[in-house]
Amino acid sequence: FEIALPRESNITVLIKLGTPTLLAKPCYIVISKRHITMLSIKSGERIVFTFSCQSPENHFVIEIQKNIDCMSGPCPFGEVQLQPSTSLLPTLNRTFIWDVKAHKSIGLELQFSIPRLRQIGPGESCPDGVTHSISGRIDATVVRIGTFCSNGTVSRIKMQEGVKMALHLPWFHPRNVSGFSIANRSSIKRLCIIESVFEGEGSATLMSANYPEGFPEDELMTWQFVVPAHLRASVSFLNFNLSNCERKEERVEYYIPGSTTNPEVFKLEDKQPGNMAGNFNLSLQGCDQDAQSPGILRLQFQVLVQHPQNESNKIYVVDLSNERAMSLTIEPRPVKQSRKFVPGCFVCLESRTCSSNLTLTSGSKHKISFLCDDLTRLWMNVEKTISCTDHRYCQRKSYSLQVPSDILHLPVELHDFSWKLLVPKDRLSLVLVPAQKLQQHTHEKPCNTSFSYLVASAIPSQDLYFGSFCPGGSIKQIQVKQNISVTLRTFAPSFQQEASRQGLTVSFIPYFKEEGVFTVTPDTKSKVYLRTPNWDRGLPSLTSVSWNISVPRDQVACLTFFKERSGVVCQTGRAFMIIQEQRTRAEEIFSLDEDVLPKPSFHHHSFWVNISNCSPTSGKQLDLLFSVTLTPRTVDLT
């Protein structure tokens, strides 16, 4: 190999050992029979050398540094050449370094031809191995602007006072052009400006200077985004830290097209703007840090550019001004992440503050819009609390548990609407009366409606789930002892059409001791399946539940249990089941932890089934499933 560097070229070539490998045989640079491990070639020198091994790329790297001095004379602006040409260099991993020094008042601009650059974070690498490391200078201090790969959006980087650009090319890479040019600009009066150009939909992740270390104190850095006017951009902060400021405040500023309040100033912890049309700028401003405990300012953010949806121009009014103790959250439904670019899906408040989730609270009217390619990616969860504090005022008072029409008119699917029903302890209980009788969801007879009511205790220490209930069954009402949550959960978009079937009334009633009472009025046509609360986990310790089962005069009810033994093993106490005829008060008592369950029995009159649990041993819980079937009486037994 022969490398000849022209005089005054300000180029230095250095060939040195790379990262040591576990190769058995060492390799040397051979110059006139001398074996060396490092070779430095300066401007005006010509050196001929060879390597002592077949694959020097496994041992050596080459660095070509060109110092460009813009302080003492004119700057060689324009397209930057790879000198010496890659064809003249040995096939080693090579790094071309351009170190440009300029006056503080001079702005320098690196312009990248297509493909543009994509910034990578710590620990990331470029697929093709080609990396661009760019740093600037503040007085004598080097500041890392970032490390970049090809195929991105970064088209220009402006700095002042100097720039150092390192282009790393793997030994096998055929690239023979630098891919960038240098131009001079007037002073930019900040650390740097990074321009990011979007041709179409896409995303870019960018980082503050020195990331993940701290951004230089009291500095300003700007990102200019070029976005086609027909697209929309949204900013989200992926990671940030704030330093301890002594003077001034760390902030981000946006210049947004069409905004009357430019610059718009945001704290880093604020929701960042979305749904921005066309070009915009984002600047990060540091502060004067506390000398004793400076902390670090750092920021990693993402800009997502996508087509506006039809919905993004539509404003939806959600009027919660007459609601109390209610919150509505629109959020992404859980999905498996795919590796390809997925357009963002945002919900915007007043068209500007866009984020992937949004919570609206009662007491106000809210205007929202959507910036989303597919609204099925979002769903709504609503929580409303109905509480009674004064038992004298609440007793017999009723509330309708219905999803407000404003919510049903939103173009996003309702997932859960939860009512938290709170009563004064040991003073009042609750009764739920559905507009349409309910069916309890069981494995034997699952619900196939577009929605269900999930009824569970709302007492934090109590793990009690009464079950899932849907319209079209035999349960006429559910009475519960204390605080519960009733959640209307939808399972299909057809809920919008079936919304009229929803409707549950809750009333506050005098306190009773049983955990729950189900009133069941079976239809002659079908078998009613009923199961104890907390199925799969077992009825909680010392809990009692009852079923009040009506039998019409001309019918006989067959009560059937689906296993021979309850399976419960009591640690303390005994578990009982009492079946009581309501007319005669005659009762059958079964010790569930000791005896077999009853064989199918026939009841000519309405009857109670009461189940009271003991304190079971773990793993031996009380779970019972039973059915009631009506058949016509053949003989008058009255």
């Epitope: 010392l542 303390t572 059958e588 008592i589 010790s591 009461n610 009271s612």
Partner: antibody, heavy 124, light 107 residues
Framework: EVQLLESGGGLVQPGGSLRLSCAAS????????MSWVRQAPGKGLEWVSA????????YYADSVKGRFTISRDNSKNTLYLQMNSLRAEDTAVYYC?????????????????WGQGASVTVSS | EIVMTQSPATLSVSPGERATLSCRAS??????LAWYQQKPGQAPRLLIY???TRATGIPARFSGSGSGTEFTLTFSSLQSEDFVVYYC?????????FGQGTRLEIK
């Protein structure tokens, strides 16, 4: 009114057998667990055995385990205690007692109604 | 097994007075304790269960208290028919066990 009437007591030689019966009335017999409790002359009460309402579970004091068997016939409203390999220390008045159903109830049994007792004497 | 110890073995009190009988368990029985009264030549009668709940038909002068290992049966004002034997019984664990009894006699 709950009534419990024991029968089958008497004098038996050590190693002999005896079967006590307890006829129940005034309540739904199958709903309630039943127990046998004995009282040796001049001594305190000692629980002997118990059986659940449908006969699915039985319990014994260590002193009688393997020798006594409790059973019930719900169709006849009758409780039994079959006593084999009797010993002198089994001499006592044997009471049958009805369990109280308290919900939630303790594991063991509380006896809210008692028979008048059947005397068993084991002597040679 | 759980050993139940009653004290005193005999208690002498005047009619109309207040009296307290004690029952101690060798290990905790929670509130699973009953008190019985036995008159000479008769079967026992349930007075209290659950440590403090009076059985049906039992006069209010009888009251029970305690939990864990220490229990008491209190008579607010002794009547002549109360001077008989009293037993405590634990039903927290098998086997069921009784105390040895306390005889209440007229002073």
């Amino acid at each position: 009114e709950v009534q419990l009437l024991e029968s089958g007591g008497g004098l038996v030689q050590p190693g002999g057998s005896l079967r006590l019966s307890c006829a129940a009335s005034g309540f739904t017999f199958s709903n309630y667990a039943m127990s046998w409790v004995r009282q040796a002359p001049g001594k305190g009460l000692e629980w002997v055995s118990a059986i659940s309402g449908r006969g699915g579970s039985t319990y014994y004091a260590d002193s009688v385990k393997g020798r006594f068997t409790i059973s019930r016939d719900n169709s006849k409203n009758t409780l039994y205690l079959q006593m084999n390999s009797l010993r002198a220390e089994d001499t006592a008045v044997y009471y049958c007692a009805k369990d109280i159903v308290v919900v939630p109830a303790a594991k063991g049994y509380v006896m809210d109604a008692w028979g008048q007792g059947a005397s068993v004497t084991v002597s040679s | 097994e759980i050993v139940m110890t009653q004290s005193p073995a005999t208690l002498s009190v005047s009619p109309g007075e207040r009296a307290t009988l004690s029952c101690r368990a060798s290990q905790s029985v929670s509130s699973n304790l009953a008190w019985y009264q036995q008159k000479p030549g008769q079967a026992p009668r349930l007075l209290i269960y659950g440590a403090s709940t009076r059985a049906t038909g039992i006069p209010a002068r009888f009251s029970g208290s305690g939990s864990g290992t220490e229990f008491t049966l209190t008579f607010s004002s002794l009547q002549s028919e109360d001077f008989v034997v009293y037993y405590c019984q634990q039903y927290n664990n098998w086997p069921l066990t009784f105390g040895q009894g306390t005889r209440l006699e007229i002073k």
